[in-house]
Amino acid sequence: IVLRPSRVHNSEENTMRALTLKDILNGTFSYKTFFPNWISGQEYLHQSADNNIVLYNIETGQSYTILSNRTMKSVNASNYGLSPDRQFVYLESDYSKLWRYSYTATYYIYDLSNGEFVRGNELPRPIQYLCWSPVGSKLAYVYQNNIYLKQRPGDPPFQITFNGRENKIFNGIPDWVYEEEMLATKYALWWSPNGKFLAYAEFNDTDIPVIAYSYYGDEQYPRTINIPYPKAGAKNPVVRIFIIDTTYPAYVGPQEVPVPAMIASSDYYFSWLTWVTDERVCLQWLKRVQNVSVLSICDFREDWQTWDCPKTQEHIEESRTGWAGGFFVSTPVFSYDAISYYKIFSDKDGYKHIHYIKDTVENAIQITSGKWEAINIFRVTQDSLFYSSNEFEEYPGRRNIYRISIGSYPPSKKCVTCHLRKERCQYYTASFSDYAKYYALVCYGPGIPISTLHDGRTDQEIKILEENKELENALKNIQLPKEEIKKLEVDEITLWYKMILPPQFDRSKKYPLLIQVYGGPCSQSVRSVFAVNWISYLASKEGMVIALVDGRGTAFQGDKLLYAVYRKLGVYEVEDQITAVRKFIEMGFIDEKRIAIWGWSYGGYVSSLALASGTGLFKCGIAVAPVSSWEYYASVYTERFMGLPTKDDNLEHYKNSTVMARAEYFRNVDYLLIHGTADDNVHFQNSAQIAKALVNAQVDFQAMWYSDQNHGLSGLSTNHLYTHMTHFLKQCFSLSD
């Protein structure tokens, strides 16, 4: 059990107060983390509270300002990037968000040697992506879907691509579906380790159907937003990978990297690119039916100026029980011999573990094993491999950092974080300097987050980087809810849950229950992390019990649980929420006449299906921006889990798993349906179709739309949304205002 203290002890009981909705909406109890911007083995940059960019040297203990807040303010810079030769800094301003990761901005180059902005051959605006080479001060950037190269910031640019066209051809940046569902980045270009070569992706969206929606704005006529967006079964982007020599870019121009024959024989995706050396690159490809992935290692052929990807350097990863990988196919971490690598994939028992591949995947050496999962490889050095897992004490919702000594035989394993601040810290990530000389640990909870700096050789803590003292003080007079993480064993399935209990929780009393659900494939909601959020308020002030349950389809507990939902989305996720609710009722402190469920996105889909399950368990529920039919969602995501919506594949389950098919079953529940009209991700179409089906079935329901808001419902919409949902739940649970 993980119990979060309901308060920091304070003898003045009457000074304690419950959380308010205002606290949550104002972000009063938000926390800070400290991620060093590493620039060498022992130096990092950090933006100080007063906006100076400060360089810290861990070994000398010295720090100095490399860029003043005055310079930052002169161009209204909100971000910066130091060139590796430390001669220039780019300053980013006029940030304009596009999709989840992408944005455009204006860039200014500041010359640190003379303390002036570089004049002449200034960068165009707005730029879609810009980055320094890993060595020196070359610049690559994307402007109007074309890639440009500058040898020095003041030089004229060299134009690398010429065919870039809005919504048609994307060079060096992903299109919508690759950004959201495959790369999870705003960029699609990669410098080789010493900056000799630049690799980039070209996405051709010419044949992709377009989603169009109105953006109302303030004008007399609304604008129409058009996005090439492949829904399940639709035409997909066509991807090609090119590499150009940045020293002599005009010599032979960009050279295309060949696609493995077994991939190129049908529709496919490019999934990631990893440079190994300046003349060796590793590409990962995936069949459209996403159970076969190929890792291809390619070498530069000086004589032909081309890239050669021999079949002997193709490594196939295949899943027979589900899709390849977890959410994404994992990426390799190469060792110092520049050919062998470490990679996370399923072992014979169906748990994701680290494997060492020297020649073939069949001969892979398993590095970690057990009924838990390795989650991320942070760094491989000559003698150590650092990774995170949920092994410790068998809690899948924890993350600890481990070091395996690979320089000695047999390799020894050490948990770096397990006993550091055991009660406070059970969920870590890490950030390593060059050669892992030093590293920062960022602990996310369950206690108040803390960031610390450590020696990479001895693991000794050097200093606290951020401990959120102000937050700790602010929480001293707050009655926080209690949290516990436990598990239910039901029919050979383990259902981990987090329960958030009112501060004066009494097991002999009855409480209204709210289920918060996400439940998407390879997600995890039950995590040992700190949060003061809306559900904290509902428990603290409104006396609700809130529960989060990780059912079938969720991650980091083995393939049996993860792949249980393969080709059957919308079935077991819902069943497991219902099963958990029944178990909670059996615990004796839940008022079974006051049970609600809510979720956002995939969680909106699950909450809708749970409400329409006909069990009579739920009095009411809320779906925010739900998927309503898998035919409406993106191809890359949907087909990974559902296959294709064709008669000879899985059309039947696509049709059976819609919310609309269950419209009649909403008759006996109170349903609140919410969606942003400018949702580029889960299109408003999804909620429009639910509403239409409910109207056609003559079922009453409540709804709220947010004009011109996307999937995140940000800004003032957030306040309105949570206020509205609070009123809805309080009314459902007969709680006075």
Partner: nanobody, 118 residues
């Protein structure tokens, strides 16, 4: 949308001269920087000359400096490339291009072939 049509290409002996012309149509030509690119078989596309919006600033790579001259006539919506002392390595398809920012090109012509051979 801007349309560009090149002319003036052809076969010329080494040491000879050619003048390429490019006619622009579309409403925003005078806002644009203009340039000439070339692409030889099996090679990358290379910028050989560029001229700023006003004509006050020009750019040439070392390979053509002193031999090629770019000029523009905004009233006629024309851009020219005077090529002197031509060499065999100047053989390529030459493209006219325009862009909204200096040295950034968004619109392209279809190209005109220049062959330098004896």
């Amino acid at each position: 949308e801007v349309q560009l049509v090149e002319s003036g290409g052809g076969l010329v002996q080494p040491g000879g001269s050619l003048r390429l012309s490019c006619a622009a149509s579309g409403s925003i030509y005078d806002l644009y920087t203009m340039g000439w690119f070339r692409q030889a078989p099996g090679k990358g596309r290379e910028l050989v000359a560029a001229i700023s919006r006003t004509g006050g600033s020009t750019y040439y790579p070392d390979s053509v400096e002193g031999r090629f001259t770019i000029s523009r006539d905004n009233a006629k919506r024309m851009v020219y490339l005077q090529m002197n002392s031509l060499r065999a390595e100047d053989t390529a398809v030459y493209y006219c291009a325009v862009g909204q920012y200096d040295w950034h090109f968004d619109y392209w012509g279809q190209g005109t072939q220049v062959t330098v051979s004896s």
